[in-house]
């Protein structure tokens, strides 16, 4: 029977700036019980505060609701680890809500072939940013990324399409079934999960000559 | 102990590339941006880019872009700073740096000379 | 790309004594979001840079409280109330608002 090892808080997420969780790896339980809480103070305070929230973000988990999330402030944050022979924290963890966000999946993705009379016929895709994220404001710059295959090919194809909310695909194998999804994330955060698929039948007519 | 471990000294031709690595240990790799930063000889200090090792999205200083890429290696806990098209003014002691979830230093590696010479 | 300046170039304290670095920036450091994101290093003689202040005025963890940060917009200050000799290095600002993130060309401290 040991004290417990050393826990490492590894992820924090927020979805839209307002709100974050942060997860913390357990250590070695010393073959014992072993209590986790989690405590911060926020930049140019001193005094401690512990976890507002253990539960919403699940197992290993600190949520901070509405009211205890600033954007203005770093967030200073360890795990301490206690069960009957003692105790052992996590190194301090330094958090700017900025750099965590995670964004949910755009909307209304939308996709067309288009095969005007004079130009080469093209795949048209338009999407919508996710709800919650508030891109008025001017700091939140969201980058799309849009992925593609025919129905039953295991590759996708991949295009990066900056902060544009409008692609156009020229190169389709004409007579296919097409997937197309497509994914966002600010420029310093992390990637939403991809959209819902979109089915897409590529006509048989669809040529790509000149 | 959060260590970020790089590859030794390297002497270049002018014209070749050069990769150096970051090795790092201590926490989990793919949690923090990792960044490269450079100093030439008596001189300060030059941000080269950035990498988020969880997906490997990067973004570099545009006065290297086409000449450096970074990359990272999720199985071994690595990153790699690769700069091609040497010229004598690239040498410099290459560092890499890691962040937290924000957009400063915290840590940094020892440092790796790249000396460029005909 | 922000330049970063700082002034002076190199300082000479005796030990005890207080001292004053200046940092000035070609732009504003306020982020969109509302930050400041002015940070200083620290090289020792042979060493890696070392993290000291980070946005403007907050000390990293294990710093002494002898380093202090202030200032807004363009102009910023470090300011070391007692040097002692394991002050001695180059002293970096750095911004990390705008990409590329940019460091002041460093000020020299050496013990008199």
């Known amino acids: 029977q040991l004290p417990p090892g050393k826990p490492e808080i590894f992820k924090c997420r927020s979805p839209n700036k307002e709100t974050f969780t942060c997860w913390w790896r357990p250590g070695t339980d010393g073959g014992l019980p072993t209590n986790y809480s989690l405590t911060y103070h926020r930049e140019g305070e001193t005094l401690m505060h512990e976890c507002p929230d253990y539960i919403t973000g699940g197992p290993n988990s600190c949520h901070f609701g509405k009211q205890y999330t600033s954007m203005w402030r770093t967030y200073i944050m360890m795990v301490n680890a206690t069960n009957q022979m003692g105790s052992s924290f996590s190194d301090e963890l330094y958090v700017d809500v900025t750099y965590i966000v995670q964004p949910d999946p755009p909307l209304e993705l939308a996709v067309e072939v288009k095969q005007p009379e004079d130009r080469k016929p093209y795949l048209w895709i338009k999407w919508s940013p996710p709800t919650l994220i508030d891109l008025k404001t001017g700091w939140f710059t969201l980058l799309y990324e849009i992925r593609l295959k025919p129905e039953k090919a295991a590759e996708w194809e991949i295009h990066f399409a900056g902060q544009q909310t409008e692609f156009k695909i020229l190169s389709l194998h004409p007579g296919q079934k097409y997937l197309v999804q497509v994914r966002c994330k600010p420029d310093h955060g992390y990637w939403s999960a991809w959209s819902p698929a979109t089915f897409i039948q590529i006509p048989s007519d669809f040529t790509m000559n000149d | 102990e959060v260590q970020l471990v790089q590859s030794g000294a390297e002497v270049k031709k002018p014209g070749s590339s050069v990769k150096v690595s970051c090795k790092a240990s201590g926490y989990t790799f793919t949690s923090y941006w990792i960044h490269w930063v450079r100093q030439a000889p008596g001189q300060g200090l030059e941000w080269m880019g950035e990498i988020d090792p969880s997906d490997s999205y990067t973004n570099y200083n545009q006065k290297f872009k086409g000449r450096v890429t970074i990359t990272a290696d999720k199985s071994t806990s690595t990153a790699y700073m690769e700069l091609s098209s040497l010229r004598s003014e690239d040498t410099a002691v290459y560092y890499c740096?890691?962040?937290?979830?924000?957009?400063?230093?915290?840590?940094w590696g020892q440092g790796t000379l790249v000396t460029v010479s005909s | 790309d922000i330049v970063m300046t700082q002034t002076p170039l190199s300082l000479s304290v005796t030990p005890g004594q207080p001292a004053s670095i200046s940092c000035r920036s070609s732009q504003s450091l306020v982020h969109s979001n509302g930050n400041t994101y002015l940070h200083w290093y620290l090289q020792k003689p042979g060493q890696s840079p070392q993290l000291l202040i980070y946005k403007v005025s907050n000390r990293f963890s294990g710093v002494p409280d002898r380093f202090s940060g202030s200032g807004s917009g363009t102009d910023f200050t470090l300011k070391i109330s007692r040097v002692e000799a394991e002050d001695v290095g180059v002293y970096y600002c750095s911004q990390s608002t705008h990409v590329p993130f940019t460091f002041g060309g460093g000020t020299k401290v050496e013990i008199k």
């Open positions: 740096a890691r962040s937290f979830f924000t957009n400063w230093f915290a840590y």
